[in-house]
């Protein structure tokens, strides 16, 4: 706490300028009027104040705004919002995507902090749901932002919002994210063509079931190894040799290198030998000829 | 521009564990498997495992099963080797090198890092 | 497992003169790789799919052969080529490399 000591004869401020860079900490607080300090909180950020001049500002913004400052005011924070904790951010209500741009503006290049995090939770919870221009502008600040979300939070996404979402967004994700979000995509997509469909919805493909692979399959598409090896394992298992031959197309060489790996490692597995040396790879591992294979799972279900 | 950033030299007592590091950057982490390499001073390469990052799934060598564990932090895009019950037969360079999925060779490799086991 | 046996296992060479290397295998395989390593630096990517020359690599490089026999051509030796050659084969588990060939300056 800053002691109250009155402001010496004519150090009052008329205006937040440069001048008071050199007034000391207890002269802020006793000469820079909190009223006017909200009005020209825009000035705040192109004078060079210490950090412990910008603590006094903001006890002064505190003192004015007990219940949370308003837009106005955070708008023009700047740098004074690195000194704000997730406490005061959840007094606010932001609902300008301005707002929000600006103040992911001063935290740019650095890990999504707690404070960041409150405040984008409070924009989000207070628009209802993540559409498509906050999803926008929170995936350019933090590409991870999608994958750092629970399925459930994920579930409020609109399809419309799924044409923001770049490939490197969906980096993290992980299989339980995509199982929500790739329904959305399919939807989202629907009325492209084939090869467009496909540069759009192969990032999403994690969350994709096996009719859906199956159908992708006719589709001449030339699936990459890297989007193969991001398929459920269950999604997988029941595509047949010739199946994975035509979703792969001219990549279907790489499941020689990936063949300890899964998906690709269980999927051999459940092949028959034969089936598997017609792609002339020497993929090994598949069921040897003359056995017969039991669908235990298919029996249970009619017992 | 790739990197593959390694941590430093570590010299450890025998009997001990040590941990590797190796940070990639400049494109997508999850294209790629993490392989990790040894060379002994004046000797040829050794391929000790991989790892994918998308679905933690490892392959090791035979011969390094139960020496080497492979780990990978997607969010940071970091890779990581733990050697376990180390002897001076561990004593060496290792190196962290990037593998295209579905490609049989190393596009870019870290820049080693020297594990001294000596009591 | 496949054994990849290199040689010569050193070799030396004047500069613009040709040189080439072997790289023999006991199996047939699909693809070799070629490494250079110099003194106190990591591998560096050659030749992929045996004859494919890696980004940045100059064409004075070349790769060819197949299935147990595989070579690795320098059309005119500079005085950077002074290195450590490794070919290295991705067919069958585990992954392997050869003993290298060292190539020096004359």
């Known amino acids: 706490e800053v002691e109250k000591t009155a402001c010496p004869s004519g150090k009052k401020a008329r205006e937040i300028d440069e001048s008071l860079i050199f007034y000391k900490k207890w002269e802020l607080e006793a000469c820079v009027d909190a009223a006017l300090l909200a009005t020209q909180m825009d000035r705040v950020n192109a004078i060079p104040f210490t950090y412990e001049q910008l603590d006094v500002l903001k006890h002064k913004l505190d003192e004015l705004y007990p219940q949370g400052y308003p837009e106005s005011v955070i708008q023009h924070l700047g740098y004074l919002f690195l000194k704000m904790s997730p406490e005061d951010i959840r007094k606010w209500n932001v609902t300008s995507l301005e707002t929000l741009k600006a103040l992911l503006e001063v935290n740019k290049g650095h890990e999504m902090s707690p404070q960041v995090a409150t405040l984008i939770d409070r924009f989000v919870k207070g628009r209802g749901q993540l559409d498509k221009d906050t999803l926008d502008t929170l995936t350019a600040f933090y590409p991870g932002y999608l994958c750092s979300l629970s399925p459930e939070e994920l579930s409020s996404v609109p399809p419309s919002s799924i044409w923001a979402v770049r490939p490197q967004d969906l980096d993290t994700c992980d299989p339980r994210q995509l199982d929500v979000l790739y329904p959305k995509a399919r939807l989202a997509f629907q009325n492209m063509n084939g090869s467009e469909y496909f540069v759009k919805i192969q990032s999403f493909l994690g969350g994709a079931p096996t009719e859906d692979l199956k159908a992708l399959s006719q589709q001449n598409v030339s699936m990459d190894l890297a989007t193969f090896m991001k398929l459920r394992t269950d999604a997988v298992l029941p595509l047949t040799v010739a199946e994975v031959q035509k979703l792969l197309g001219p990549h279907v060489e790489g499941l020689k290198a990936e063949e300890r790996h899964r998906p690709v490692r269980d999927w051999i597995l459940r092949q028959r030998q034969d089936d598997l040396d017609t792609l002339g790879l020497g993929l090994q591992g598949g069921i040897p000829n003359g056995y017969l294979v039991l669908d235990l799972s298919m029996q249970e279900a009619l017992s | 521009e790739v990197q593959l950033q390694q941590s430093g030299p570590e010299l450890v007592k025998p009997g001990t564990s040590v941990k590797i590091l190796c940070k990639a950057s400049?494109?997508?982490?999850?294209?790629?498997?993490m392989d990790w390499v040894k060379q002994r001073h004046g000797q040829s390469l050794e391929w000790i495992g991989d790892?994918?990052?998308?679905?933690?799934?490892?392959i090791y060598n035979q011969k390094f099963e139960g020496k080497a564990i492979l780990t990978v932090d997607k969010s940071s895009s970091t890779a990581y080797m733990e050697l376990r019950s180390l002897t001076s037969e561990d004593t060496a360079v290792y190196y962290c090198?990037?593998?295209?999925?579905?490609?049989?060779?190393?596009?870019?490799w870290g820049q080693g890092t020297t594990l001294t086991v000596s009591s | 497992q496949i054994v990849l046996t290199q040689s010569p296992a050193i070799m030396s060479a004047s500069p613009g003169e040709k040189v080439t290397m072997t790289c023999s295998v006991n199996?047939?395989?699909?693809?070799i790789y070629w490494y250079q390593q110099k003194p106190g630096s990591s591998p560096r990517l050659l030749i992929h799919?045996?004859?494919n020359l890696a980004s940045g690599v100059p064409v004075r490089f070349s790769g060819s052969g197949s299935g147990t026999s595989y070579s690795l051509t320098i059309s005119r030796m500079e005085a950077e080529d002074a290195a450590t050659y490794y070919c290295?084969?991705?067919?069958?588990?585990?992954?392997?490399f050869g003993g290298g060939t060292k190539l020096e300056i004359k």
């Open positions: 199996l047939s395989v699909r693809y």
């Open positions: 790892i994918n990052p998308n679905t933690d799934s490892t």
């Open positions: 290295q084969q991705w067919s069958s588990f585990p992954y392997t």
């Open positions: 799919d045996t004859s």
């Open positions: 400049g494109d997508t982490f999850t294209a790629y498997n």
């Open positions: 090198a990037r593998r295209k999925l579905g490609r049989g060779y190393f596009d870019y």
